[in-house]
């Protein structure tokens, strides 16, 4: 129920990447506005992006601050030019969004070799450890500093001649592999937090080939 | 309840080909690796090869290199070997199993096997 | 490849005894070893993994431990449904490779 002229939102979805976390939502308005509010299970409701003509709501503020909470958002519609007007009810439509955990959800985003030096028949291969909007002290922290050791990473590595691609893991954000003398290895990385159920894996970060700008060959 | 159900083994001869399938059910295949390992009768556990179903990158021992391929949809959450070239020595039980992922964790799940029998 | 030499390939014991297997990788592994339980006709089942960590459900008296790139599994009083073949694996790098395992059989 509710005035003639709003209609609830619906399909209310969280989309987040490396806790960069924004609420989207249908229809796009006609004769209509939104307000989103935000809380945590035991928290108060917090509003953000007032009266806006926009289907999505960049609510990373308040997800960072606590990423390990629970978060519940909903979706406010208000007839457009006549905010105070609401539902039969007494109260303006809203709709709930699902639950969302940031720590548990957030989309790995797509990592980056920093870069590989080989000495000899060994490669070091070093992740970029990316920042996030996650804050402490004043400072962003970076992926590895929010995830700790639940974050790992997997390298795919292959001769530049083949297709088969070997596998190696590690929980910092470097690898130490070995390789054979006089052959051109590429490789991709993938972020993994094992420990989730589902959204487990990062797409694959670039592929970099040694003969490569970012690589360092050192003859030993 | 995650599981893991191999399919498709059987008798063929020597040069011959075979399709297994390993369904998944309880989890999805694209957040984990999948596996094939095999074992000859009487004989201890063989590596064959592992899929990653997120970006269809794969890797073989060498003794099916260039005639096994692993493949996966997703769609329908299943693995599947294709064994073409088939030799004698190519009999065994075939487990497909789940790669959990992580640096400390490997094969945690494994399906019952299915038998191929490569003989003339 | 990295080469898993597992010893022995079977043993004798009797119900309570202490049972020790090991597997030798032949570089590093660092902790990346995990050990196997397969009964005839039957999967194996994961016991061990990263050397030292008892797998969800496995009973306290099997252990792991690693000394350099010396592994072993411990069963410290065997019980009836021990009896099974046991197996290492590495899983560090690319081919994942197994011991040969070890047949554990009754007195």
């Known amino acids: 129920s509710g005035t003639t002229n709003t209609v609830a939102a619906y399909n209310l979805t969280w989309k987040s990447t490396n806790f960069k976390t924004i609420l989207e939502w249908e229809p796009k308005p006609v004769n209509q506005v939104y307000t989103v509010q935000i809380s945590t299970k035991s928290g108060d409701w917090k509003s953000k992006c007032f009266y806006t003509t926009d289907t999505e709501c960049d609510l990373t503020d308040e997800i960072v601050k606590d990423v390990k909470q629970t978060y519940l958002a909903r979706v406010f519609s208000y007839p457009a030019g006549n905010v105070e007007s609401t539902g039969s009810a007494g109260e303006p439509l809203y709709e709930n969004s699902p639950e969302f955990t940031p720590y548990l959800e957030t989309n790995l985003g797509q990592p980056t070799i920093q870069s590989f030096e080989q000495v000899g028949t060994k490669v070091n291969v070093t992740v970029e450890d990316e920042r996030t909007l996650v804050r402490r002290n004043n400072t962003f922290l970076s992926l590895r500093d929010v995830f700790g050791k639940d974050l790992i990473y997997t390298l795919y590595y292959w001769k530049s001649s083949s297709s088969g691609k070997k596998t190696a893991k590690t929980n910092t954000n470097e690898f130490l592999i070995d390789v054979d003398k006089g052959e051109n290895y590429c490789f991709s990385v993938q972020a993994v937090i094992p420990s989730r159920t589902v959204n487990r894996k990062s797409t694959d970060s670039p592929v970099e080939c040694m003969g490569q700008e970012k690589g360092e060959f050192r003859e030993i | 309840e995650v599981q893991l159900v191999e399919s498709g083994g059987g008798l063929v001869q020597p040069g011959g080909s075979l399709r297994l399938s390993c369904a998944a059910s309880g989890f999805t295949i694209s957040d984990y690796w999948i596996h094939w390992v095999r074992q000859a009768p009487g004989k201890g556990l063989e590596w064959v090869g592992y899929?990653?179903?997120?970006?269809?990158?794969?890797y073989y021992a060498d003794s099916v290199n260039g005639r096994f391929t692993i493949s996966a949809d997703t769609s329908k959450n299943t693995a599947y070997l294709q064994m073409n070239s088939l030799r004698a020595e190519d009999t065994a039980v075939y487990y497909c199993?789940?790669?959990?992922?992580?640096?400390?964790?490997?094969?945690?799940?494994w399906g019952q096997g299915t038998l191929v029998t490569v003989s003339s | 490849d990295i080469q898993m030499t597992q010893s022995p390939s079977s043993l004798s014991a009797s119900v309570g005894d202490r049972v020790t297997i090991t597997c030798r990788a032949s570089q590093d592994v660092n902790t990346a070893v995990a050990w196997y339980q397969q009964k005839p006709g039957k999967a194996p089942k994961l016991l061990i993994y990263?050397?030292?960590f008892l797998y969800s459900g496995v009973p306290s008296r099997f252990s792991g431990s690693r000394s350099g790139t010396d592994f072993t599994l411990t069963i410290s009083s065997l019980q009836p449904e021990d009896f099974a073949t046991y197996y290492c694996?590495?899983?560090?790098?690319?081919?994942?490779?197994f011991g040969q395992g070890t047949k554990v059989e009754i007195k």
């Open positions: 990263s050397a030292s």
């Open positions: 199993a789940r790669d959990y992922g992580s640096y400390l964790v490997s094969l945690d799940y």
């Open positions: 694996q590495q899983h560090y790098t690319t081919p994942p490779t």
């Open positions: 899929i990653d179903p997120y970006n269809g990158y794969t």
